[in-house]
Amino acid sequence: LIIGFGISGRHSITVTTVASAGNIGEDGILSCTFEPDIKLSDIVIQWLKEGVLGLVHEFKEGKDELSEQDEMFRGRTAVFADQVIVGNASLRLKNVQLTDAGTYKCYIITSKGKGNANLEYKTGAFSMPEVNVDYNASSETLRCEAPRWFPQPTVVWASQVDQGANFSEVSNTSFELNSENVTMKVVSVLYNVTINNTYSCMIENDIAKATGDIKVTESEIKRRSHLQLLNSKAS
């Protein structure tokens, strides 16, 4: 969480941002809140980015002002116009690109004063892994697949029964470049699996950590997966 205060001139207002990550090709949110004003027409929201000459987005007098928007963000940004009055200056960024990563500034002007806060935005690709029993293999084998990751993650296997065991000798991980030539499909195979055990396939890069669990018994197979972003710090 980053909390920024106003600069010279009028009174300062508090602006708060939260560092976040964007998934390439999907929509992302750059979070920013501020002390609200009673009149929408008095609120100016500006998003700026380090390394970019023009504005990322500008909202003033109750509407988007696009004439100074930098070409790299054209048609890809929007604020939540109906929530500006309650102090939400968050920016929706459509079709996140790798190059969208960097330092952003949320800059607010209201009748109460001015304020700004920086936000670190990471971009990459992350997806839920799915773990399945590989019935085609000669021995009991598990296959963990996740369709989109970037940068290249690490893959670690763990088991409930053999806690602390190192499975690197009995697993094989491959990374296959996807058609857009940025993200990769992650496939990891674990051999010599025993029944009545829960195995976890953990995929992690500097943006996200995802886990796919599978419990194999004689009567059933149970699966569970979850994904966690690693860098949500407020500012």
Partner: antibody, heavy 116, light 113 residues
């Protein structure tokens, strides 16, 4: 109201450098880029480059790359354009302007004369 | 880079008559994302900086008389002065702000016939 006040006219020798200043007032200086445009006598308008004052990010026209440096001082709301290795063809009025795209506000211009 | 070409280079028109200036861009300045043309027109009088007249190809800047109008889309644009006044004598420039480097037309000088 928005105002951009530029430094006075300069006479320079070929091979030397010139630094033109542009003091902004009437708006939030850190919010908008400052653009520099020049106009040779009797000629059209030529984009030199611009700067995002809050991050110091500068972009230059390829023609001036390596010869021009645009900077900004947030504390004084002033932008600067320095052009080095001056030649006679650099004789022109140099304008600063608010914004990096649509230019609604211009400085009054600074005449730079390059003569031996 | 986008190149802007204006025609004619100069134009002599009688007071009260219509003046038309054309501007052509080497590639489209129409953005598909917002359907706006990133084109502006400026007026410059001797010894003064340019003054913004029209933006988004056809939106008049506040305070600009309604005898000035802009039209066109994509690559072809026109500035029209419907009834030329003595104070309209100036050089007029079109400018694209679709992408950097910003580019201006070479200018069209408007005089009274």
């Amino acid at each position: 109201q928005v105002q951009l006040v530029q430094s006075g006219a300069e006479v320079k020798k070929p091979g030397s450098s010139v630094k033109v200043s542009c003091k902004a007032s009437g708006y939030s200086f850190i919010s908008y880029a400052i653009t520099w445009v020049r106009q040779a006598p009797g000629q059209g308008l030529e984009w030199i480059g611009g700067i995002n004052p809050i991050f110091g990010t500068a972009k230059y026209a390829q023609k001036f790359q390596g010869r021009v440096t645009i900077t900004a001082d947030e504390s004084t709301s002033t932008a600067y354009m320095e052009l080095s290795s001056l030649r006679s063809e650099d004789t022109a009025v140099y304008y600063c302007a608010k914004g990096q795209a649509l230019i609604q506000h211009w400085g009054q211009g600074t005449l730079v004369t390059v003569s031996s | 880079d986008i190149v802007m070409t204006q025609s004619p280079d100069s134009l002599a028109v009688s007071l009260g008559e219509r003046a038309t200036i054309n501007c052509k861009s080497s590639q489209s300045v129409l953005s598909s994302s917002n359907n706006k043309n990133y084109l502006a027109w400026y007026q410059q009088k001797p010894g003064q900086p340019p003054k913004l007249l029209i933006y988004w190809a056809s939106t008049r800047e506040s305070g600009v008389p309604d005898r000035f109008s802009g039209s066109g889309s994509g690559t072809d644009f026109t500035l029209t002065i419907s009834s030329l006044q003595a104070e309209d004598v100036a050089v007029y420039y079109c400018q694209q702000y679709y992408s950097t480097p910003l580019a201006f037309g070479q200018g069209t000088k408007v005089e009274i016939k």
